[in-house]
């Protein structure tokens, strides 16, 4: 006989998570990323909104900009000029797409404690940045680029052809912002500010997506966005460089496109300055399996940029597309010609390579059945990178240092044993010359940010440890989490299972699959989260599982490229396979299994529900893609090729959700979409709904008026409340 646990007072004070906790963000965490301004100094916005400068070596900190000054213009962001004379203050933030926004900018002169008057900046500005040295300003206003030598000077207009929705200078159009760069800017200062490079995007021939924005007016507005869907006309890109000291002297000079790229449709993928007179551009064929890295030099005699064929490096994939989600960027070494870059090795794992003359002669720096994920910094003697090597868990991230100053290079894991239980997923932020760095640990325990010495890796101080969150969670019954793997037909399926707090293997639980599953994504990660699915496990007693199947990242090209030209097949199969394995574990109620996903996950959940397996009782698709012909060219064609007869039209047609309308008859389906989704257009759900109606299949639906792909604000609360009711009804759980 075991003693009753009723009298355990600690157990009694514990409570389950509530939906309100999640919607209120009660258990959100903080991270600390220093805004580095030198090798040993950084800026940080204090809790009371003062901008404080910290000097690590002297241990001192002081306010450089008061909250009073910030408040005087309602500033929500700031940027210090490298010469430390001025600060720009950003206010009237107005979001556009994922990264882009417009804002009003004020320049504050630190030497006299006053705002710069005269030649004020126009408003609203689309992008603004300081030069890397001094206090020159480059900004984009109404799709044109302007330059100021000093904040109080009149501006010099660099481009004149900018036009809304037609020509974009220094900022990307919709598709380059979302799928290629992916940034809000498309201009780059040279290291000492001598030159400014920028992209011009010509969208004149791109078809336009138009949708209604209802607002409060009598007549809805129409939003028009040049948006190339699969197979459509794409933006035409050109790269220019201008001398910022004498901008009117020769004006912007165009950088030539490599001949093998220019012969057909192509993309520009990134620009990296090497020195003030050497620049590296990366280009990509429209069929995205060939990428060219081109190193160009400034010719003083002609005032032009020369990109010799001998400095072109080709990266090609024979089994899939070039790169992972994006083609990786080079990190140049101090000789200003050789560089480090991540690409697939001969065994099909993404690893760091050192390229000195040709890609064929590249020296492989890392190797193994794991992947190098990001190169953070290269110094004279060290290379810092992240990988998922440690203990063979693909969903972890640790930071490593390779000593490149000695031979053979030695490797050290900086983070593997720091806080092993708490921290298995790190990123890092380095000061100039990697004198110091911050580590930000995202989990699996409560996130923590720490400051470290760049030479010894010694921890100097804790920047943020989320003490309040730790205290707040003390009386919460959090679900248990497991990360394990299934081996099925030579495929490894990693999964994360979230289990109710009082989980008992001898009982039966409803199962919810949360899926994303897009190419080069990863859902099974060792990170901390208290979110909707945590609540569903904690309070509603559900088991939730996330599975990384074929097409997902960081486990080698075999898994990643398995979905090439065949989206919507193996991702779905692998979710189904995993569910069958979960049922075999004995604690899943096979009559109560659901699946849900958002975006690509909505596509996969829809196809899984319509797979005809009878495994799923119900499911939810939020903002799903329903046909790859409706989605963006850059993303879709990377994985699917073109929707033409002589390419891959057949699979474009076979992989739609609409083609499977009949199969929804025996499941409960909830379809959700925002009407102002600029990314996955409402068209996708409209077509699913039409096909279901035409097939006389019952389903549930919810639209969110004027909401985009993120369904933010009050819509979020409504969305999760609505989905909770739907799942509880499906699983026969009392309200």
């Amino acid at each position: 006989l075991r003693p009753s646990r009723v009298h355990n007072s600690e157990e009694n004070t514990m409570r389950a998570l509530t939906l309100k906790d999640i919607l209120n963000g009660t258990f959100s965490y903080k991270t600390f990323f220093p805004n580095w301004i030198s090798g040993q100094e950084y800026l940080h916005q204090s809790a009371d909104n003062n901008i404080v400068l910290y000097n690590i070596e002297t241990g001192q900190s002081y306010t450089i900009l008061s909250n009073r000054t910030m408040k005087s213009v309602n500033a929500s962001n700031y940027g210090l000029s490298p010469d430390r004379q001025f600060v720009y203050l950003e206010s009237d933030y107005s979001k556009l797409w994922r990264y882009s926004y417009t804002a009003t900018y004020y320049i504050y002169d630190l030497s006299n404690g006053e705002f710069v008057r005269g030649n004020e900046l126009p408003r609203p500005i689309q992008y603004l940045c300081w030069s890397p040295v001094g206090s020159k300003l480059a900004y984009v206003y109404q799709n044109n680029i302007y330059l100021k030598q000093r904040p109080g000077d009149p501006p010099f207009q660099i481009t004149f052809n900018g036009r809304e929705n037609k020509i974009f200078n220094g900022i990307p159009d919709w598709v380059y912002e979302e799928e290629m760069l992916p940034t809000k800017y498309a201009l780059w200062w040279s290291p000492n500010g001598k030159f400014l490079a920028y992209a011009e995007f010509n969208d004149k021939d791109i078809p336009v997506i138009a949708y209604s924005y209802y607002g409060d007016e009598q007549y809805p507005r129409t939003i028009n966005i040049p948006y190339p869907k699969a197979g459509a006309k794409n933006p035409v890109v050109r790269i220019f460089i201008i001398d910022t000291t004498y901008p009117a002297y020769v004006g912007p000079q165009e950088v030539p496109v490599p001949a093998m790229i220019a012969s057909s449709d192509y993309y520009f993928s990134w620009l990296t300055w090497v020195t003030d007179e050497r620049v590296c551009l990366q280009w990509l064929k429209r069929v995205q399996n060939v990428s060219v890295l081109s190193i160009c030099d400034f010719r003083e005699d002609w005032q032009t940029w020369d990109c010799p064929k001998t400095q072109e490096h080709i990266e090609e994939s024979r089994t899939g597309w070039a790169g992972g989600f994006f083609v990786s960027r080079p990190v140049f070494s101090y000789d200003a010609i050789s560089y480090y870059k991540i690409f697939s090795d001969k065994d099909g794992y993404k690893h760091i390579h050192y390229i000195k003359d040709t890609v064929e002669n590249a020296i492989q720096i890392t190797s193994g059945k794991w992947e190098a994920i990001n190169i953070f910094r290269v110094t004279q003697d060290s290379l810092f990178y992240s990988s998922n090597e440690f203990e063979e868990y693909p969903g972890r991230r640790n930071i490593y240092r390779i000593s490149i100053g000695s031979y053979p290079p030695s490797k050290k894991c900086v983070t593997c044993h720091l806080r092993k239980e708490r921290c298995q997923y790190y990123t890092a932020s380095f000061s100039d010359y990697a004198k110091y760095y911050a580590l930000v640990c995202y989990g699996p325990g409560i996130p923590i940010s720490t400051l470290h010495d760049g030479r010894t890796d010694q921890e100097i101080k804790i920047l943020e440890e989320n003490k309040e969150l730790e205290n707040a969670l003390k009386n919460i019954q959090l679900p248990k989490e497991e990360i394990k793997k299934l081996e099925v037909d030579e495929i490894t399926l990693w999964y994360k299972m979230i289990l109710p707090p009082q989980f008992d293997r001898s009982k039966k639980y409803p199962l919810l699959i949360q899926v994303y599953g897009g190419p080069c994504s990863q859902s099974v990660r060792s990170v901390f989260a208290v979110n909707w699915i945590s609540y569903l496990a904690s309070k509603e007693g559900m088991v939730i599982a996330l599975v990384d199947g074929r097409g997902t990242a960081f486990q080698g090209d075999k898994l990643l490229y398995a979905v090439y030209r065949k989206l919507g097949v193996y991702e779905v199969e692998d979710q189904i396979t995993a569910v069958r394995k979960f049922i075999e574990m004995g604690f899943i109620d096979e009559k109560r299994i659901a699946i849900w996903g958002w975006s690509y996950g909505g596509y996969v959940s829809s196809l899984a529900l319509a797979s005809g397996t009878g495994l799923f009782k119900c499911g939810i698709a939020v903002a799903p893609v329903s046909s790859w012909e409706y989605y963006a060219s850059v993303y879709t064609e990377r994985f699917m090729g073109l929707p033409t007869k002589d390419d891959n039209l057949e699979h474009y047609k076979n992989s739609t959700v609409m083609a499977r309308a009949e199969y929804f008859r025996n499941v409960d389906y909830l379809l959700i979409h925002g009407t102002a989704d600029d990314n996955v257009h409402f068209q996708n759900s409209a077509q699913i709904a039409k096909a279901l109606v035409n097939a006389q299949v019952d389903f549930q639906a919810m639209w969110y008026s004027d909401q985009n792909h993120g369904l933010s604000g009050l819509s979020t609360n409504h969305l999760y409340t609505h989905m909770t009711h739907f799942l509880k009804q499906c699983f026969s759980l009392s309200d």
């Epitope: 030198s38 400068l53 002297t58 306010t63 430390r84």
Partner: nanobody, 117 residues
């Protein structure tokens, strides 16, 4: 509390030279990035020259090639060597952190430099 004590100013003929010193004491350290500023009569205070903690320097266009900022960490002192002085260099010269710290008592008394023609 930070104390900033500027000295070395004076009256000098155009074309002449002066060397300003600034001793930093209190809860501050001259190894921080430091700068010289100046304020002419009836004008706003402007930045003149700066030295970042790694030793690199920067100058306002008006003084480039004539003024040199340096420091001696052991003495907690920042210097401004001013050559080829012009009448328009006449001002009260101050030193401070770069960017300047704000708040009461964060500026010293300054040192007057007068350049006669």
């Amino acid at each position: 509390q930070v104390q900033l004590q500027e000295s070395g100013g004076g009256l000098v003929q155009a074309g002449g030279s002066l060397r300003l010193s600034c001793v930093v004491s209190g809860s501050f350290d001259s190894r921080n990035a430091m700068a010289w500023y100046r304020q002419a009569l009836g004008k706003e205070r402007v930045w003149v020259a700066g030295i970042i903690s790694d030793g690199s320097t920067n100058y306002a266009d008006a003084v480039k090639g004539r003024f040199t900022i340096s420091r001696d960490n052991d003495k907690n002192t920042v210097y401004l060597q001013m050559n080829s002085l012009k009448p328009e260099d006449t001002a009260v010269y101050y030193c401070n952190a770069w960017p300047p710290r704000i708040g009461l008592g964060s500026w010293g008394q300054g040192t007057q430099v007068t350049v006669s023609s």
